[in-house]
């Protein structure tokens, strides 16, 4: 058993059918010695008397808020949560496995640049009685500070018989060094509590591996005289790291016909313009990627050929 | 050619070669399904690798003030990786495929390090750790880790030379 926060305790339960459970001793936080009784949650049933109460925690029915009283007055509370292990594996029932980029991916994180700011998000199908707490650091043995805000509900999606809730959090490394080569990964730890169930989730990454630039901005077409060719131009997104001579992007320009089956023409360039042939009813799209490190491409920025 | 000490390197040549290094490093080890090699306990390998750190002067301001600190650090790393790629980690079993980019990568690391430091001039180089994994699978894992680490190193080096070519060239 360990303390999650004041008066809230997590009991680690290795569960299997007929498991003996965990013996837990609760102590009433009071100088009083006599006449103390114990109850669980809203029930008035007396579970025991005395300054300490020994319970056997076998299942969620044994968790909850234990209260000690004396003569009708509440002396102290202890909220017991369960962290369940089955077949040697801690439960991961609260969050959905996003399966991208690999199985058992519960937390996904992205950064728009090298400033040390990043966003993580996760999915759940639970709509109520749910709290999250996020901590982060750079490295684990001698951790350097990363400050995370509060996790907030950022989206709700209905997919057939499933309703999903997306939560996200923004974090900022306290002393970020955008130009340095990271040697210690960022660690993100999420505590999730649903009713009386405690679970924790972790992710470890380098900022360079979660970079996804915003799409290029100000995408424009300039027709070339007496030609089907157009000059496409664009700019670096505002959110990208500066100076651009140092933090450079590379771009992919795509000409796509109305039909998905039509052949796509693609051009790769380090410049912020390109000359392409504009077909009728086609659209031109441009996306960006770090020039020197193959992290994610941005989403496409698009304009119609007409 | 670059001349260490006080004068400037051939920024444009360095830029071109470092960008080529980035391409080669990624073709030698593409993102294999986001293979997370940090889970494999890599203290003994990649902790000894020279990283370009915050105080090494490789940021735009540091390069403007005095690029020599940064160039020395990059040179140190290039020599380190050049030695690693020439060691039995890469020459031993399992053999690399004949068309593997590792050979080109090795030659380009040497080429860039020579651009930064011609014969007769010596910056201090870092001692290469003695890593001789006994099992072929260990060697394979070590190769992946070294290449992942090299990708990060050459990315920073390429940014340095691109910025130098754009802002510090005579």
């Amino acid at each position: 058993i360990w303390e999650l926060k004041k008066d809230v305790y997590v009991v680690e339960l290795d569960w299997y059918p007929d498991a003996p459970g965990e013996m837990v001793v609760l102590t009433c936080d009071t100088p009083e010695e006599d006449g103390i009784t114990w109850t669980l949650d809203q029930s008035s049933e007396v579970l025991g008397s005395g300054k300490t109460l020994t319970i056997q925690v076998k299942e969620f029915g044994d968790a909850g808020q234990y209260t000690c009283h004396k003569g009708g007055e509440v002396l102290s509370h202890s909220l017991l949560l369960l962290h369940k292990k089955e077949d040697g594996i801690w439960s991961t029932d609260i969050l959905k496995d996003q399966k991208e980029p690999k199985n058992k991916t519960f937390l996904r994180c992205e950064a728009k640049n090298y400033s040390g700011r990043f966003t993580c998000w996760w999915l759940t199908t639970i709509s109520t009685d749910l709290t999250f707490s996020v901590k982060s650091s750079r490295g684990s043995s001698d951790p350097q500070g990363v400050t995370c805000g509060a996790a907030t509900l950022s989206a709700e999606r209905v997919r057939g018989d499933n309703k999903e809730y997306e939560y996200s959090v923004e974090c900022q490394e306290d002393s970020a060094c955008p130009a340095a080569e990271e040697s210690l990964p960022i660690e993100v730890m999420v505590d999730a509590v649903h009713k009386l169930k405690y679970e924790n989730y972790t992710s470890s990454f380098f900022i360079r591996d979660i970079i996804k630039p915003d799409p290029p901005k100000n995408l424009q077409l300039k027709p070339l005289k007496n030609s089907r060719q157009v000059e496409v131009s664009w700019e670096y997104p505002d959110t990208w790291s500066t100076p651009h001579s140092y933090f450079s992007l590379t771009f992919c320009v795509q000409v796509q016909g109305k039909s998905k089956r039509e052949k796509k023409d693609r051009v790769f360039t380090d410049k912020t313009s390109a000359t392409v042939i504009c077909r009728k009813n086609a659209s031109i799209s441009v996306r960006a990627q770090d020039r020197y490190y193959s992290s994610s491409w941005s989403e496409w920025a698009s304009v119609p050929c007409s | 050619r670059a001349v260490p000490g006080g004068s400037s390197p051939a920024w444009t040549q360095c830029q071109q070669l470092s960008q080529k290094l980035c391409t080669l490093a990624w073709s030698a080890h593409p993102l294999v399904g986001h293979m997370d090699l940090r889970e494999e306990g890599d203290e003994e390998t990649t902790n000894d690798v020279p990283h370009i750190q915050c105080g090494d002067g490789c940021d735009p301001q540091g390069l403007r003030d005095n690029s020599q600190f940064c160039l020395q650090r990059i040179h140190q790393g290039l020599i380190f990786y050049e030695k690693l790629l020439g060691s039995d980690i890469f020459t031993g079993e399992p053999s690399l495929l004949p068309d593997s980019p590792v050979g080109q990568l090795h030659a380009s690391l040497l080429g860039l390090s020579q651009l930064l430091q011609p014969e007769g001039h010596h910056w201090e180089t870092q001692q290469i750790p003695s890593l001789s994994p006994s099992q072929p699978w260990q060697r394979l894992l070590l190769r992946f880790k070294i290449l992942r680490s090299l990708q990060a190193f050459v990315a920073v080096a390429a940014r340095v030379f691109a910025h130098g070519a754009a802002t510090l060239s005579p």
Partner: nanobody, 123 residues
Framework: EVQLVESGGGVVQAGESLRLSCAAS????????MGWFRQAPGMEREFAAA????????YYADSVKGRFTISRDNAKNTVYLQMSSLKPEDTAVYYC????????????????WGQGTQVTVSS
């Protein structure tokens, strides 16, 4: 919202078997742990069995262990309670329940309940 509809109740002789079904519908039903409770006249509702949302783990009250088997078919969104060697003291209204805390034998850990199906075991 999750809707639960029980079926399969009836009158049987002691020693016989019966299979109860609980059809679940609504959002995210596959993510719920499912349980069966029962309530005899004048008694409190008591736990009988529960199954995890993956269907890989089951939990039983001592009074039914070895006689009752809980199972689920996630493709059909249905939970079953196979009852064998029935006794007169198994007579009760059987309720299907859905919740997110497994294992739990406490009724208030379950969020949704069916209307119940009557099982009568005569001697």
């Amino acid at each position: 919202e999750v809707q639960l509809v029980e079926s399969g109740g009836g009158v049987v002789q002691a020693g016989e078997s019966l299979r109860l079904s609980c059809a679940a519908s609504g959002y995210n039903v596959k993510d719920y742990e499912m349980g069966w409770f029962r309530q005899a006249p004048g008694m409190e509702r008591e736990f009988a069995a529960a199954i995890s949302w993956r269907g890989s783990s089951t939990y039983y009250a001592d009074s039914v262990k070895g006689r009752f088997t809980i199972s689920r078919d996630n493709a059909k969104n249905t939970v079953y309670l196979q009852m064998s060697s029935l006794k007169p003291e198994d007579t009760a209204v059987y309720y299907c329940a859905a919740g997110r805390l497994y294992p739990s034998s406490r009724s208030r850990d379950y969020d949704y309940w069916g209307q119940g199906t009557q099982v009568t075991v005569s001697s």
